[in-house]
């Protein structure tokens, strides 16, 4: 272990402690305006007042006091578009990744009192205002309800809802986690006339059941319809209701494109284009074909028509359609043409402009980099993010394309703003992008700023993390490097976190942190003070993160390399990187470890069992151990089906259990929460069984009643303390 460099008293900086990390001492703040118009926004202040801001008049005032919030223990709020009412959210109770239930109260801003009569039932699964006025749509017990006004009795739109069977307006488990990435599955039309929603029928889906121990004499069983690879999937239908006359025509079903409906399929997203035009995206179960379908309301028929000539097909010949998800369209003002990110002929994801057919799409961006997200399309500008600048895949800058100009001109809005501090941005735009907020995540301290949408001038600093900056002044932070290494024809970007007094002539233990899942990215130019920062700062460990094949934003050749063969190249590339790091001369070959969580737990397990002798020890937290145990939408996207005539062989070959014998010469710590709804405890149970059967010694820790995040304060403290002890023991570092 490198000896500490002596520093005179006057300049003493301390190393990070594990306690600092567990207490969140050095966490940062971001500032996202809650836009309510072109130039107005709301923000919840530190003391929980809801404050109204007008950028142009510079006025600000409290629209909802913290005492009103506190009177119902509210933790969130939502202003109705007519500004007459606010919903207050309390009793937040987390369900899965995005979903939660809550109690809602409606506060009348005009009268300064809560709306009495026809109070909302509790707990509600989802609630939202219409985009105009103050209609309310909410989901209660898997059914959708509509209120024309907050004080009105509700109209029940659906009656089919049944716990764990039929979900209306909210996704089931697999759609929430793997397709929509939201807690809701209903969308208001821009004028609030129509409400589109999805019905998910899980009646035929197999159930995952696990024990929740709680405090009772008997554990209770959690049952979730959860389709694993190859299992029966949810049956989805999309309906649209006229909210003015919901009781007249009833829900109108939107037809599924023929080429999609001919076999198992998914609904992937819905985008309202105008008050009477909607765009639905569908995906075949074999996820290489996506269809975007534009549908119009025909007043004369009183129906939604989706003409074949308004179907746009997106197909991948080298892998799956889209990135992690299929991208969504950003429609122009004409409500016909749209901008969309998909792979160009060279396999890089770029913005295309579609006017009539995908075949005639005009490519808007191009190069050996990728467009990542379209934020906003206005009359004359398109704002998007990409990793183009200076060729670093792990950066994000915001660009503006002036689409009014011919040819369109491109400007990087963020590239040179705070170049050292800020290389990874996101943005939040007011309604027509008259103003926007930029949120910079690093590599320096995060900072949020407000900008003029016409000139891009900075108007105001919203949050600059001054307190954090001050408290970090006396901390010895590690040095972070982002570089690339080459192996054969491949380039791998890596992030290295070096101990504060790093000396290239000395030897250091190395910890590889891996995720490595398809379309993920670990090497990002973001600020973080976390467990690995502590390990470098205090324990003198070199940390490395490597983006191998299968990771995102470097083109389809790199991304699709893992298609139908998960668990091969992701592992191989981590091993390649470790060998390259050893060649750098400052790594102690006898003290190399690897750790990962979730997909990273799978990769770390396979790397430990690679038989290379590179690793002394490693940790897998909540690992996938077989793709047959994981969700259909995810597993099949990258692996196909676990059937004999498809890809069963590789499903079997790529399990951790198949490599049990190879764990004999490494120290392995296996960790899992028993109430993991996502990567089921089953995965670790099967690894443990295989290791026992192979008579291989290993260490294990379970966290009772903890889910995939092992998030409870006590569990997290225990987890990181436990992993720290394990690593220090492995690296022979004294306590």
């Amino acid at each position: 272990r490198p000896s500490r460099v002596y520093k005179p008293e006057g300049n003493t900086k301390r190393a990070l402690t594990l306690k600092d990390i567990l207490n969140g001492t050095f966490s940062y703040k971001t500032y996202f305006p809650n836009w309510i118009s072109e130039q107005e926004y709301l923000h919840q202040s530190e003391d929980d007042n809801i404050v109204f801001y007008n950028i142009e008049t510079r006025e600000s005032y409290i629209i909802l006091s913290n005492s009103t919030m506190k009177s119902v223990n509210a933790t969130d709020y939502g202003l109705s578009p007519d500004r007459q009412f606010v919903y207050l959210e309390s009793d937040y109770s987390k369900l899965w990744r995005y979903s939660y239930t809550a109690t809602y109260y409606i506060y009348d801003l005009q009268n300064g009192e809560f709306v009495r009569g026809y109070e909302l039932p509790r707990p509600i699964q989802y609630l939202c205002w219409s985009p105009v006025g103050s209609k309310l749509a909410y989901v209660y017990q898997n059914n959708i309800y509509l209120k024309q006004r907050p004080g009105d009795p509700p109209f029940q739109i659906t009656y089919t809802g049944r716990e764990n069977r039929i979900f209306n307006g909210i996704p089931d488990w697999v759609y929430e986690e793997e397709m929509l990435a939201t807690k809701y599955a209903l969308w208001w039309s821009p004028d609030g006339k129509f409400l589109a929603y999805v019905e998910f029928n899980d009646s035929d889906i197999p159930i995952i059941a696990y024990s929740y121990y709680g405090d009772g004499q008997y554990p209770r069983t959690i049952n979730i319809p959860y389709p694993k690879a190859g299992a029966k999937n949810p049956v989805v239908r999309v309906f649209i209701v006229d909210t003015t006359y919901p009781h007249h025509v009833g829900p109108m079903e939107v037809p599924v494109p023929e080429m999609i409906a001919s076999s198992d399929y998914y609904f992937s997203w819905l985008t309202w284009v105008s008050s009477e035009r909607v765009c639905l995206q569908w995906l075949k179960r074999v996820q290489n074909v996506s269809v975007l379908s534009i549908c119009d309301f025909r007043e004369d028929w009183h129906a939604w028509e989706c003409p074949k000539n308004q179907e746009h097909v997106e197909e991948s010949r080298t892998g799956w359609a889209g990135g992690f998800f299929v991208s969504t369209p950003a429609f122009s003002q004409d409500a016909t043409s749209y901008y969309k990110i998909f792979s160009d002929k060279d396999g890089y994801k770029h913005i295309h402009y579609i006017k009539d057919t995908v075949e005639n799409a005009i490519q808007i961006t191009s190069g050996k980099w990728e467009a990542i997200y379209i934020f906003r399309v206005t009359q004359d500008s398109l704002f998007y993010s990409s990793n183009e600048f200076e060729g670093y895949p792990g950066r994000r800058n915001i660009y503006r394309i002036s689409i009014g100009n011919s040819p369109p001109s491109k400007k990087c809005v963020t590239c040179h703003l705070r170049k050292e501090r800020c290389q990874y941005y996101t943005a939040s735009f007011s309604y027509k992008a008259k103003y926007y907020a930029l949120v910079c995540y690093g590599p320096g301290l995060p900072i949020s700023t407000l900008h003029d949408g016409r000139t891009d001038q900075e108007i105001q600093v919203l949050e600059e993390n001054k307190e954090l900056e001050n408290s970090l002044r006396n901390i010895q932070l590690p040095k972070v490097e982002i570089k690339k290494l080459k192996d054969g024809g491949l380039t791998f970007w890596y992030k290295m976190i070096l101990p504060p007094q790093f000396d290239r002539s000395k030897k250091y233990p190395l910890l590889i942190q891996v995720y490595g899942g398809p379309c993920s990215q670990s090497v990002k130019s973001v600020f973080a003070v976390n467990w690995i920062t502590y390990l470098a700062s205090k324990e003198g460990i070199v940390i490395a993160l490597v983006d191998g094949r299968g990771t995102a934003f470097q083109g389809d050749k790199f991304l699709h390399a893992v298609y139908r063969k998960l668990g091969v190249y992701e592992v191989e590339d981590q091993l390649t990187a470790v060998r390259k790091f050893i060649e750098m001369g400052f790594i102690d070959e006898e003290r190399i470890a690897i750790w990962g969580w979730s997909y990273g737990g799978y990769v770390s397990s396979l790397a430990l069992a690679s038989g290379t002798g590179l690793f002394k020890c490693g940790i897998a937290v909540a690992p996938v151990s077989s793709w047959e145990y994981y969700a259909s939408i995810y597993s099949e996207r990258f692996m196909g089906l676990p059937t004999k005539d498809d890809n069963l062989e590789h499903y079997k070959n790529s399990t951790v259990m198949a490599r049990a014998e190879y764990f004999r010469n490494v120290d392995y710590l296996l960790i899992h929460g028993t109430a993991d709804d996502n990567v089921h405890f089953q995965n670790s149970a099967q690894i443990a069984k295989a290791l026992v059967n192979a008579q291989v010694d290993f260490q294990a820790m379970w966290y009772s009643d903890q889910n995939h995040g092992i998030l409870s304060g006590r569990s997290q403290n225990h987890l990181y303390t436990h992993m720290t002890h394990f690593l220090k023991q492995c690296f022979s570092l004294s306590d």
Partner: antibody
Framework: EVQLLESGGGLVQPGGSLRLSCAAS????????MSWVRQAPGKGLEWVSG????????YYADSVKGRFTISRDNSKNTLYLQMNSLRAEDTAVYYC??????????WGQGTLVTVSS | EIVLTQSPGTLSLSPGERATLSCRAS???????LAWYQQKPGQAPRLLIN???RRATGIPDRFSGSGSGTDFTLTISRLEPEDFAVYYC?????????FGQGTKVEIK
């Protein structure tokens, strides 16, 4: 002009079955929810069942649930009500009406169903 | 289910008079979801008043609907000979849709 024409009514013994039809014309049938409403002799109106335009959602009054089935054939512009296990209290004039839970703006002339031994 | 109670059961009036028919709901319905129908002997019902107390197509303006919450009224400002019939209110806010028992408007 919107027209709804019911047929299939008649005399049936308790426990028997009957299938009512309603032929629709003058509007885009497949786009609209349709309902069956009945009226026992000398009594008021009672909603029996409803079906949305695509046929994908159906609802029933508790009094007929499990015995009656509403369906539609949009290619034939026809609404159906399959009535099984008929009881004396099902005796009524059965109307087909254009609408879902309300706003029944067009009605057929009705067909009489008599359940008697 | 929501029970609709109509009163009076029978209303005896002369042509030209004003008729006021009442409909009370067991729970709030709001005018958005309350409709009124007219039925003459041997005929199918006919929609009179629809969403938000609006007259249905082709209904003369002597018919008007009002009310909110649980209390609703159908008013016929000047009875014409063809208006003598049975009138039903109906709620469509909740399954099952229900009808009132009817008010018979007869010639005095």
């Amino acid at each position: 002009e919107v027209q709804l024409l019911e047929s299939g009514g008649g005399l049936v013994q308790p426990g028997g079955s009957l299938r009512l039809s309603c032929a629709a014309s003058g509007f885009t049938f497949s786009s609209y929810a349709m309902s069956w409403v009945r009226q026992a002799p000398g009594k008021g109106l009672e909603w029996v069942s409803g079906i949305i335009g695509s046929g994908g959602i159906t609802y029933y009054a508790d009094s007929v649930k499990g015995r009656f089935t509403i369906s539609r054939d949009n290619s034939k512009n026809t609404l159906y009500l399959q009535m099984n296990s008929l009881r004396a209290e099902d005796t009524a004039v059965y109307y087909c009406a254009k609408g879902w839970f309300g706003g029944f703006n067009y009605w057929g002339q009705g067909t009489l169903v008599t359940v008697s031994s | 289910e929501i029970v609709l109670t109509q009163s009076p059961g029978t209303l005896s009036l002369s042509p030209g008079e004003r008729a006021t028919l009442s409909c009370r709901a067991s729970q709030s319905v709001t005018s958005s979801y309350l409709a009124w129908y007219q039925q003459k002997p041997g005929q199918a019902p006919r929609l009179l008043i629809n969403v938000g107390s609006r007259r249905a197509t082709g209904i003369p303006d002597r018919f008007s609907g009002s009310g909110s919450g649980t209390d609703f009224t159908l008013t016929i400002s000047r009875l014409e000979p063809e208006d003598f019939a049975v009138y039903y209110c109906q709620q469509g806010i909740m399954l099952p849709p229900t009808f009132g028992q009817g008010t018979k408007v007869e010639i005095k």
